[in-house]
Structures are given as C-alpha cells and as structure tokens.
C-alpha cells in the first residue's frame, strides 16, 4: 500500500498547533485511502528545507528568497503548489518588482548612478534585494559592505531599517531610517510617497503599489516604469516592464520522489473543505494564534505548479540573477559594454559537432551548450545557461510565451539587400507519392503520416490546426493509422513509423532519422503516405542534390502536392497549392542579450555566411548537407526584423491565432509552465 502521508514541516509552536488541527480536520473529511497529514517541527525554514531534502519531511511553504535557497544544491527542492491571491477567476500567484519614476525625469535604468532612491526597507525583496541585486555589478568597488557601495552609487536614499550612523546617505531622504510605519517613507506606500513628494527620483516597489496609492488614472499617468532594456513604459504595462516577477508563497518538495501529486491532492482537497469561506471550525488561510501560519492569511487558494517547472524557471531569470549577485558577489571582469561570447544552444550530438566547429572558427565569439530537445534549449536560454538558437515558428511562439524575443530572421531567397529585408515566409505543404493517385486532402483518415516534429510549423501546427478544424478533437493518433511525429508520446501510433534506434526512437532531434524536413520526406519515401514539410524540401532532396543512399536516385516528378480544395498539383506549383504560409525560422534570445546576439551574429554571417563559396575547405554557417543543423541549409542570410521584434509581431496575428487554437491539443510541458508564469 503506497504511503499517502504528507509530512508537513512547521517552524514554531503555533505552526505545529495549526498543523495538528489541519491533520485532525483532514482526517474527518477524507476517506481512509486518501491523503493524510503528519506534522514535523523544526526550528527554522532552513531546517525544514534540509529535513525535506533528507526525506524527514515532505513539504513546507516558503517565500521567494527561501525557494531559491531550497533549490540550491544539496537541497534540490522544487516548487509544487503555489498560493494564489485575488479571485479564483483571476488568480494572482506572482507580483512584479518595479522601478517607478516621474514621467518628466528623463533617465533610464542604466543612468541611475547619482540619482536619489526610495526603498521599502533594507533587505526586503522588491525594495532592496531585487533592484540592488540587478544593479550589483554597476556598484562602485569595493562592493562590501553592500550598504556603503549603495550609498556611494546613489546621491541619497531612504532605505528604512538601515544603520543611519554607519551609512547616513541611506537615511538622507528619511532622517533616522525608522523601521516601521512611524517613518512616513517606510514600506511600499512609503517608498512611493518618497518619490511622489519629490524626495527621491526612483522608487523600488511592487506593481500594485501605484494602483493602491493612486486611484485616478490621470494621476498614475504622471509616472512611468523603468525597464531593464533601458526604455520606459506606462505603469499599467508592468508585465512587460519590471525588474523581476516574484512568486508570493510556494509549497516546495523534493525534485525526485517528492510526492508532488500527493501534495497537490491533499491541498486541493484541503481548499475544497477548509479554504476561503468554507468552514467555521478550521480555516486553512487563517491564523488565530499568530500570523501567516503554514500559509499566508491573505491567500485565496492553491494552484498546481506545472511539473516541467523547476525553481529556476519558477523564480525567473531576473530574480535568480539578482539574488545570486547578492549572495555570491561575483561580477564579470570584462567591461559591461563589451559583448560576452554568445552561448549557442545545440540540439543533441550532430548539432553540437557543427556548433563546436563554429566555436573554433569564431575565435571566442561563440560557445556551445547542448540539450536533447528544442524545449530544453528554450528553457536553458530562459535561465541563462544558453543565450540563443534559431527556431521554427512553432517554437518561436513557445519561446515568446516564455519571455524570449526574436532577434534575426532566416532568409531563404537571394536578394541584393538580404540582411535588410525579412521575407514574408515559406509555404507549408502536404506531399504524397504520385503513384498514390487516389489520395487527396479529404481522404487522409487512416493513412500513414510523416511530420517534421510535434510543435513545428509546417510539420505540425499548420496541418494539425487545419485538421482540428475539421475533426474537432485532438486525437490525431487515431485519425492517422500510424506515423512519425518526433516528440509524440513513445507509445503513440505517431511514433510507430519512426526509425530511431532504442531511446532515440521518435526523439525530436537528429538522432531520429525521420526528424525535421529531410527526415519527414525520408519517412514518406520509405514508409509513409503523406509528409508535411516546407515547399523547398522535395527539390532539395531529389535530382541527386542529397547524396545519401536513400535520396540519391529520387526524382521530383514522382511526388505531388495535396491542395486544400481536394485537388493535386506538381511540386513546383506550391504557390497555388499549399496549406498555409509559414513564418521563417528566427533566432531567439533573452531581452538582455538582444543587442549582443544581433551584433555578434551579423559579424559571424559576414565571416561564414553565404559569401563563402567553398564549404568543403571552409566553415559554412548555413550548410550541413541537408541536415538543417543550427540553421536551415537553405538560409541565405540572417535578416534584421526592424519593428517585428516581439513574437506576436514576428509571427503575425493569423499564425499566433492558429497556434493559439491548437493550444488545447498542446502536449508542450514548457508552454504549460510558461503560461503559468504569464497566463
């Protein structure tokens, strides 16, 4: 019988008392085969973290700073359930730390030196740890003691709770630095008042502070937010302009064998019976013998944290950077205006080899990081382990939802001004063998299908989106008799046709021979009835252009396209017979890396791009003998995006809507995790 006990960790007598009450009340409402509570008392949150890591306890609720400690080795805990605030319809699990300024003050984030600052309090998250952590490497050396470095960075401050004797500049704007509401500039509202009164130039608060203190929109319009990319935005655009997105209060558990499903089952049932306005005799979100015991009194309920989400992703790159800077106190030696090497994310073994050769030739400009799937690469870019990669439009969508931005687009047509002219896109097509003359778009049911990979544009999002509109369900593996769609569940019929050996079967990388455009076409040639690829795939792999044994004798004339009106056309007539226009692949990165990635990639393509004529004797960035490694092999150049510099603008309204419609069929664990952070 599986042990269905969750050992909750309590950090005080009062918490232990509430925990016992929680245990007893849960016993009375949950059947004997359901989850139960046991209580473990420890002296501190850090002791609780250690106890959970050592399997002496299972769960505890922590503030963001402690979630970071819990994630660090050797603890390796992960967030499993989040408290939410506000309403069930619009649950708030995060707040945003922001830098507020007056509209006419005219400076940016990188010009804060010498300004006057207003803080909620020394050591507090939004008011101190996050802004000072992010500014840490700009502080004058020596950076220890930190208060002295901050005092020398700003021309004057109000940082309540600071030592006014040792660091008088930190109390210059609020004499005495009082650590309570007796100090008019203490806390969120106080820090904002410090700005409003004209004492300071910038206030470090949370996004709701402005709304709580200024009910009138006209008054709010006198203020702006400083963004990390050295721009400003209106105060209601805090989701796109903040210092960090911070989780409010989170239940953590072990990463391995952590009982996360059981913890959720317990808490979900607990909120049903003892949540807000549910029961008189025991209330989960109430602390008669104290404040915020086990859970925050202001919480309204719980939400399950998506399983793909580790602590780094949950806390977010900015927050982790800020806290790591404060804790570790290390800064790069290079001046910050110089670009560090770009860490390119390579998918599995084959891309890594090409990336390595690029790295050797780039003379220190490119480093390589490996991951097994595109989603793992996106996650690495999000958390700073990698910086950039080129993605199919379907993954540009996921990366965009995860906060990454497109920076350059692959262009596939030769033109005089290639780098300045991003193209409209390529065509997604359905290819069949000419010999299967009865096959049309309208009778694909029961046929064998070949896809580039799940989540990619031409191979999945476009054809499956069109199919979904027809069949109104997501069971594509029942629609086709079998197929190869790398990235599908291994036991799915859409992995049956794949050719990878052992663990590589159906993997969404080049270890699966039927992965990508060339792979999907190979799948059609060898086993399938229809392949969903791009309009250039057939000509690129026929007529001897692909020397591989399976392709060297193929003839373009032996293949045809399926048109949406039920007719068929020759391959060269793709302009009048395609499923949709697809956005070109694009390079994505984090916002903070955008300028450097742009600069370094433009240098790299001038050295190793299409201008290199002999790829047998030179490194060529856009060649890998039909394998599309790192970039599509038909890339002519990487083009500037001009104003199409967000994922929505880049992909276009129509495509974003199409992928959005297919979201209900999504198996992307990363997309689920990212939409949890930003619904």
């Amino acid at each position: 019988v599986p042990d269905k006990t969750v050992r909750w960790c309590a950090v005080s007598e009062h918490e232990a008392t509430k925990c016992q009450s929680f245990r007893d009340h849960m016993k009375s409402v949950i059947p004997s085969d359901g989850p139960s509570v046991a209580c473990v008392k420890k002296a501190s949150y850090l002791d609780c973290i250690r106890a959970i890591a050592a399997n002496e306890a299972d769960a505890v609720t922590l503030d963001a700073g402690l979630v970071y400690d819990a994630y660090l080795a050797p603890n390796n805990l992960k967030p499993v359930v989040a408290e939410f605030y506000g309403s069930k319809e619009d649950p708030q699990t995060f707040y945003y730390a922001v830098a507020v300024v007056k509209k006419d003050s005219g400076f940016q984030m990188n010009q804060l030196r010498g300004k006057k600052s207003c803080h909620t309090g020394l050591g507090r998250s939004a008011g101190w740890n996050i802004p000072i952590g992010l500014l840490y490497c700009d502080l004058p050396e020596p950076r220890k003691p930190l208060e002295k470095a901050v005092a020398n960075f700003f021309s004057g401050s109000c940082a309540p709770c600071a030592d006014g004797t040792d660091f008088p500049q930190l109390c210059q704007l609020c004499p005495g630095c009082g650590c309570s509401t007796l100090n008019q500039y203490f806390g969120y509202s106080g820090a904002f008042k410090c700005l409003k009164d004209g004492a300071g130039d910038v206030a470090f608060v949370k996004h709701s502070t402005i709304f709580e203190n200024l009910a009138n929109k006209a008054d709010r319009d006198q203020y702006e937010l400083l963004c990390l990319d050295n721009t400003r935005k209106p105060v209601d655009e805090y989701k796109d302009c903040h210092l960090a997105q911070v989780p409010s209060h989170t239940v953590v558990a072990r990463s391995m064998g952590g009982k996360e499903d059981l913890i959720w089952e317990l808490l979900n049932q607990a909120q049903e019976h003892f949540g807000k306005d549910k029961s008189k005799e025991f209330q989960l979100f109430s602390s008669p013998h104290g404040k915020d015991l086990l859970f925050k009194d202001s919480a309204h309920g719980f939400l399950k944290v998506p399983p793909r989400m580790d602590a780094k992703m949950y806390l977010g790159y900015e927050y982790v950077t800020a806290i790591r800077n404060l804790r570790e106190g290390t800064c790069p030696e290079a001046p910050t205006d110089e670009c560090k090497p770009v860490k390119w994310c390579a998918l599995s073994h084959h891309e890594r080899l090409k990336c390595d050769e690029w790295s050797v030739n780039s003379v220190g400009k490119i480093e390589c990081v490996s991951a097994e799937t595109t989603e793992d690469c996106i996650a690495k870019i999000m958390n700073g382990e990698a910086d950039a990669m080129s993605l199919d439009g379907g993954f540009v969508y996921i990366a965009g939802k995860c906060g990454l931005v497109p920076v350059l687009a692959e262009n596939y047509n030769k033109s005089d001004n290639c780098e300045d002219t991003p193209e409209a896109g390529y065509f997604a097509i359905a290819v069949v063998k000419k010999s299967a003359s009865d096959l049309t778009w309208d009778n694909l049911k029961g046929k064998k299908s070949c896809h580039t990979a799940v989540g990619r544009t031409a191979g999945w999002n476009i054809p499956m989106g069109l199919l979904y509109n027809k069949i109104n369900h997501c069971r594509f593996d029942e629609f086709f008799s079998e197929g190869c769609a790398p990235g599908s569940k291994k036991d799915s019929s859409l992995c049956k046709l794949c050719m990878g050996s052992g663990l590589n079967l159906c993997e969404p990388n080049n270890k699966e021979g039927y992965y990508g455009y060339t792979g999907a076409f190979r799948c059609l040639v060898e086993k399938g009835d229809v392949a969903f690829v791009k309009h250039q795939t057939v000509p690129q792999n026929t007529g001897g252009k692909n020397p591989d044994p399976w392709a060297k004798n193929l003839n373009e004339k032996d293949y045809e396209l399926l048109c949406l009106d039920g007719t068929r056309k020759p391959v060269e007539e793709y302009a009048n017979c395609h499923l949709a226009r697809a956005p070109n692949h694009a390079v994505v990165t984090r916002k903070d890396k955008e300028a450097c990635v742009h600069k370094i990639l433009r240098q790299q393509q001038h050295l190793f791009g299409s201008n290199v004529t002999d790829c047998s004797g030179n490194f060529c960035l856009f060649r890998s003998e039909t394998k599309d490694l790192l970039f599509r092999d038909d890339t002519v150049c990487l083009a500037k995006l001009h104003d199409r510099n967000t994922y929505e603008k880049y992909l276009g309204e129509e495509y974003v809507k199409a992928v959005g419609n297919l979201r209900k069929c999504s198996t992307s664990s990363l997309l689920e995790a990212c939409t949890f952070r930003r619904p």
Partner: nanobody
Framework: EVQLVESGGGLVQPGGSLRLSCAAS????????MAWYRQAPGKGLELVAG???????KYADSVKGRFTISRDNSKNTLYLQMNSLRAEDTAVYYC???????????WGQGTLVTVSS
C-alpha cells in the same frame, strides 16, 4: 575522403605528459578545422581542442593552460600535447576534420589515455 588514425595514448601518472598524434591519409592543408574530442567512460563526446587552418585555437575550460593543439600540414598530422595530466583526463581521444559534416556516426578507433597512480 581523408582517413585519420590516432596514436600516442597510454598509461601515465597524474602530473605527467603525453603527446597524441593524428595522422591523415591525405593532405590536410585545405581542411578548415581540425579538433580533438574525448569520451570518458559512461560520458558523451566532448570537444577538447580545435584549430583552424589559420592557426586559431580553442580549448575546453578544463584543459586550458595544460593542453596544446597544433597541426603540421607538411606532415599531414594533428597533435595534442597534454601536460599536467589529471585523473579526470582519462578517456578515449579522437581526432576529426569535420569532413563528414557533423553527422558522422563513424569515428576512428581513437587512442586511450589513462591517468592513474
């Protein structure tokens, strides 16, 4: 296609030195990039050092300052001078000229380096 054969491996004590050679069956003068990789037991392949035709080099962080890659185009040979060897340098070492354009699943037999006291 040029064939590459690695040699020079062996058993050496920590702190010792070895020089690996990679002999090519044809001219390497026109080869853009050559590199040494290694595979430790139970681990994946990792780039140890690479060199371009023009002589620019790159090293893995773990070997910087200890290993030196060089090529002698007149002898059609790639070298890896390994000094201050450590136990964690134990691996099979392979050379590549990237001529199979990255998707080679074929590597030579390699040369085994064992660092142990």
């Amino acid at each position: 296609e040029v064939q590459l054969v690695e040699s020079g491996g062996g058993l050496v004590q920590p702190g010792g030195s070895l020089r690996l050679s990679c002999a090519a069956s044809g001219s390497i003068a026109s080869i853009a990039t050559m590199a040494w990789y290694r595979q430790a037991p139970g681990k994946g392949l990792e780039l140890v050092a690479g060199i371009t035709r023009g002589g620019s080099t790159k090293y893995a962080d773990s070997v910087k300052g200890r290993f030196t890659i060089s090529r002698d185009n007149s002898k059609n040979t790639l070298y890896l001078q390994m000094n201050s060897l450590r136990a964690e340098d134990t691996a099979v070492y392979y050379c590549t000229d990237y001529s199979r354009k990255y998707y080679q699943d074929y590597w030579g037999q390699g040369t085994l380096v064992t660092v142990s006291s």
